[in-house]
């Protein structure tokens, strides 16, 4: 059974992940000129089911495409702290949260999503898991 300290650690990691994802989304939404409409032409794959920490495998598999899109956006006056570091940090948290003992094959939904829909989905996931821990 999870101890209170491990639950607290999980909660803090999820909150960190949540903040990172929200920072990316805010960077997209708060950029006053919608010059970043081209980012919406990139598609992302969504999990069929995302209710447990192990489902973060689906987020992990999409981090490379996410990094590529954000790198392309950087050259269009979209300013985010170093994308490589940010994605690397997210990756580290995701690996710790999902655990490496069980390798899950991610099951994707049929429908793909824009970067905004993708980020919102994983933000909701984090918020949902955090609420169950508190």
């Amino acid at each position: 059974a999870p101890t209170s300290s491990s639950t607290k650690k999980t909660q803090l990691q999820l909150e960190h992940l949540l903040l990172d994802l929200q920072m990316i989304l805010n960077g997209i939404n708060n950029y006053k000129n919608p010059k970043l409409t081209r980012m919406l032409t990139f598609k992302f794959y969504m999990p069929k089911k995302a209710t447990e920490l192990r489902h973060l495998q689906c987020l992990e598999e999409e981090l490379k495409p996410l990094e590529e899109v954000l790198n392309l956006a950087q050259s269009k006056s979209f300013h985010l702290r170093d994308t490589k570091d940010l994605i690397s940090n997210i990756n580290v948290i995701v690996l710790e949260l999902k655990g490496s003992e069980t390798t899950l094959m991610c099951e994707y939904a049929d429908e793909t999503a824009t970067i905004v829909e993708f980020l919102n989905r994983w933000i909701t996931f984090c918020q949902s898991i955090i609420s169950t821990l508190t």
Epitope: K35, T41, E111
Partner: antibody, heavy 116, light 108 residues
Framework: EVQLVQSGAEVKKPGESLKISCKGS????????IGWVRQMPGKGLEWMGI????????RYSPSFQGQVTISADKSINTAYLQWSSLKASDTAIYYC?????????WGQGTLVTVSS | SYELTQPPSVSVSPGQTARITCSGD??????AYWYQQKSGQAPVLVIY???KRPSGIPERFSGSSSGTMATLTISGAQVEDEADYYC???????????FGGGTKLTVL
């Protein structure tokens, strides 16, 4: 209601210059890209380039770079496509369209005929 | 330069299902969009982001995408659907727009 109204048909001789226009209304013109698309007689659609009227940032298709100039005057909500020296092969319908990651609203098209 | 490939023509009888394909190497990661262009008219968006239908577009129009292939499906094609159909996407960078060569749909 979003509208893009283009200037009328033009008949020109080879070597002449030309500037056609596209006036936007019903939305914030400065915060959407405007694209230009060429359609030669009996042929398909070709993307020429886009401009962001807010700061005149412009991207051209490699096929049209150096052949045309795309500009905009945000004070009058108008985008332009111009040629300094027309060729017979420039004969086509030219469409402007609002770009939201894809072209959601289109102008009615401007027919340009270049003939000696 | 990036290319999108469509069949030049597709023919169906009224009421039949018409399928128009579009292939491109970047389509696993880039959305496809579809335009209908009737003779002498400006193009009209019929499908965006692979499968979404703008308001005002009949339900018989649908889109799908798998791997490097996007498909526009017209279920129960009608005579008024006779037109040229163009797929549209962007290159890997997202900067340059590409149209497919167009498909002439004939509803006999």
């Amino acid at each position: 209601e979003v509208q893009l109204v283009q200037s009328g048909a033009e008949v020109k001789k080879p070597g002449e210059s030309l500037k056609i226009s596209c006036k936007g209304s019903g939305y914030n013109f400065t915060t959407y890209w405007i694209g230009w698309v060429r359609q030669m007689p009996g042929k398909g659609l070709e993307w020429m380039g886009i401009i962001y009227p807010g700061d005149s940032d412009t991207r051209y298709s490699p096929s049209f770079q150096g052949q045309v100039t795309i500009s905009a005057d945000k004070s009058i909500n108008t985008a332009y496509l111009q040629w300094s020296s027309l060729k017979a092969s420039d004969t086509a319908i030219y469409y402007c369209a609002r770009d939201t990651g894809y072209f959601d609203y289109w102008g009615q098209g401007t027919l340009v005929t270049v003939s000696s | 330069s990036y290319e999108l490939t469509q069949p030049p023509s597709v023919s169906v009888s009224p009421g039949q299902t018409a399928r128009i394909t579009c292939s491109g190497d970047a389509l696993p990661r880039k959305f496809a969009y579809w335009y209908q262009q009737k003779s002498g008219q400006a193009p009209v968006l019929v499908i965006y982001e692979d499968r979404k239908r703008p308001s005002g577009i009949p339900e018989r129009f649908s889109g799908s995408s798998s791997g490097t292939m996007a498909t526009l499906t017209i279920s129960g094609a009608q005579v008024e659907d006779e037109a040229d159909y163009y797929c549209y996407s962007t290159d890997r960078s997202g900067d340059h727009v590409v149209f497919g060569g167009g498909t002439k749909l004939t509803v006999l």
